[in-house]
């Protein structure tokens, strides 16, 4: 008998800026939007108003099983993986065009679902488009090589797709991280099952409709929203999945690594937590530094794994910088409605995270740290928190050591370059880092000394799809973006011929 799944109907949504569209609400499996097998749905909330936007289907283990089966068939039974890679590139290019033609809508969906400002959302969508364009270009350019080992032999390598890829993304950059994961996987001939964060599924499902529209074959892209403990666990534990890419907390990342290894020794990419240091040297230009510090920690309401959440300032500039930082935040940085162009910072994405951040602010006060500015929520409705700066902190405080994942930063003083680097490197994390200096030699010397996957000099949280991103130490392993990511989605086969 032919398997039958109930279709999930889209809902019409009018966004706060007046744009209206049809939002898919079903699980996207085998190019169909379907209801979960048990019929369950869950509400998606607008964090700016705390209102329910719509209900979407919540995948069960059985739904994930079916998605894996469909993806498995797409990989093994169709020409997707074996066709001329230029054809995959053409489809990715069409997908980029489609996303670009709808950038206003997709940015608005992102602002509604995530709570980030419309301007920031637009930047995220732009990076997503660029990821797709890069992937389209790289699809037939990432190749093996020939190896000369002397007379009598010919040697070459081929790069082959891995197979079914499980991909789990967080709620802080829903569309951007979807593209970071899906674009290179498809370029290299893999097939994907992506679990968006339960709280931010809207753009993932809308993106799925664009995949179908441009002609990506059934089973190649599957989107399964739902709770991590069922959907995420099903992906990490299933032996048919050969590659798992996870972005999220270090704690969950460790269990993903264990489960992925125990199930079938999956290849894994982990992009995990951070407690990144932002070093400001005496010679830094304060006027240029302030926006970098703000982007470092208050961009996306601090909900960035690479956030510069520990600022270390050289003693000669410390007092001046603190005063300037306070004035800048209190006059230039507005918090509120993501659709209001005047606001730099929107809402925290969900209630749970809002409560976590407010709890950390309370912990900081109890630990004896002083508040330079902020420290309170904004308004009665929605999850808004004023940018918060703690100073007079010591390295043993929880607010200095633990990832808060919100608009909260600590500022401490250092004397020498070596001391600053030592403080920066004292964390078990190693995702991002920042250096503010007018001296190129200082910048490059310190960059070499910092234990981090990314070092930003005179900028921060500044991403480009052509530049790899990832962590060292407990911030994970593997890289996303850049040429490096394409190799993460291939297996190398060596061929040695005796002539």
């Amino acid at each position: 008998t032919k398997l039958h799944f109930d279709t999930a109907e889209p809902v019409k949504i009018t966004l706060p800026n007046g744009l209206t569209y049809e939002q898919p609400t079903g699980l996207f499996i085998n190019n169909k939007f379907m209801k979960a097998q048990d019929g369950k749905t869950y509400p998606v909330e607008d964090p700016s108003t705390e209102n329910t936007v719509c209900e979407v289907s919540s995948a069960t283990t059985e739904d994930v099983e079916y998605a894996i089966e469909c993806a498995d068939r797409a990989f093994h039974d169709t020409e997707w993986a074996t066709q001329d890679p230029r054809e995959r590139g053409r489809l990715l290019s069409k997908l980029a065009d489609e996303l670009e033609s709808q950038i206003d809508l997709v940015s608005s969906i992102e602002a509604l679902d995530n709570g980030k400002t419309l301007a920031l959302a637009r930047g995220d969508v732009t990076i997503a488009i660029n990821c797709l364009r890069d992937a389209a270009a790289y699809a037939d350019k990432v190749n093996g090589r020939t190896i000369n080992t002397g007379d009598g032999y010919m040697n070459f390598t081929t790069l082959e797709p891995i197979g079914v890829c499980g991909q789990i993304i967080p709620w802080n950059f829903p569309i951007m991280m979807l593209a970071w994961k899906i674009a290179p996987a498809l370029a290299m001939g893999n097939v994907c099952i992506l679990k968006p964060a339960a709280v931010t599924p809207l753009n993932a499902l809308y993106f799925a409709s664009l995949c179908k529209k441009v002609g990506i074959p059934a089973g190649v892209v599957n989107i399964v929203p739902g709770p991590g403990r069922t959907v995420g666990a099903a992906l990490t534990n299933d032996p048919r999945i050969r590659k798992l890419a996870f972005t999220g907390s270090t704690e969950v990342g460790k269990s993903v690594a264990v489960d992925s290894s125990e199930s079938n020794l999956k290849k894994i990419t982990l992009e995990l937590g951070g407690k990144s240091a932002h070093l400001v040297f005496d010679d830094a230009n304060i006027k240029k530094t302030l926006p970098n510090l703000v982007n470092g920690i208050f961009k996306n309401a601090g909900q960035i794994c690479s956030s510069g959440s520990r600022i270390y300032v050289q003693e000669g500039i410390y007092d001046e910088l603190l005063a300037a930082f306070k004035a800048y935040l209190e006059t230039e940085i507005k918090v509120g409605n993501p659709f209001d162009k005047a606001n730099f910072q929107g809402a925290i994405t969900n209630r749970q995270q809002f409560d976590t951040i407010m709890n950390y602010i309370d912990i900081g006060k109890k630990e004896g740290a002083k508040i330079l500015t902020g420290g309170e929520k904004v308004g009665d409705k929605g999850y808004f928190i004023r940018p918060t700066v703690f100073y007079d902190v010591n390295e043993d405080m929880r607010i200095v050591k633990e990832e808060i994942f919100g608009p909260v930063v600590t500022v401490a003083k250092f004397k020498t370059l070596e001391e600053g680097v030592e403080m920066a490197n004292s964390s078990e994390f190693g995702l991002g880092s920042g250096i503010e200096t007018e001296s190129l030699s200082t910048g490059l010397k310190v960059a070499k000394m910092l234990k981090a996957g990314t070092v930003w000099i005179n900028t921060y949280n500044d991403f480009d799809s052509r530049v790899p991103f990832g962590g060292v130490k407990q911030s994970g392993y593997g890289r996303e973006m850049g040429e490096e990511v394409y190799h993460a989605y291939t297996e190398v086969k060596a061929v040695r011929i005796k002539l």
Epitope: T1, K2, L3, N30, E69, D72, R73, H76, D77
Partner: nanobody, 111 residues
């Protein structure tokens, strides 16, 4: 019209063996990735094993080392050899491919 017909189930004791068959018509087993799934009483559907069109096989960790999936291209039939059966293997077993699934065959393991 596609038809998948499972057979070979039955009541056996723990430690015994069974061989399930899945005869396909209107559908070529060798060019399609084929799976065995099972549903235990009161539980959801659980994947058991896959035989790929390209020839490879994969097994759920719960059955690895005990079950073997195979196919006979000439007979257009998929098989599941189940050894060292355990009470927790009790379920209705279904074979499937390309969005089709058979009616299932009952396997009961009990002493």
């Amino acid at each position: 019209q596609v038809q998948l017909v499972e057979s070979g189930g039955g009541l056996v004791q723990p430690g015994d063996s069974l061989r399930l068959s899945c005869a396909a018509s209107g559908f070529t087993v060798s060019t399609n990735t084929m799976t065995w799934v099972r549903q235990a009483p009161g539980k959801g559907l659980e994947w058991v094993s896959t035989k790929y069109s390209t020839g490879g096989t994969t097994y759920a960790n719960s059955v690895k080392g005990r079950f073997t999936i195979s196919r006979d291209n000439a007979k257009n039939t998929l098989y599941l050899q189940m050894n060292n059966l355990k009470p927790e293997d009790t379920a209705v077993y279904y074979c499937g491919g390309a969005d089709y699934r058979g009616q299932g065959t009952q396997v009961t393991v009990s002493s």
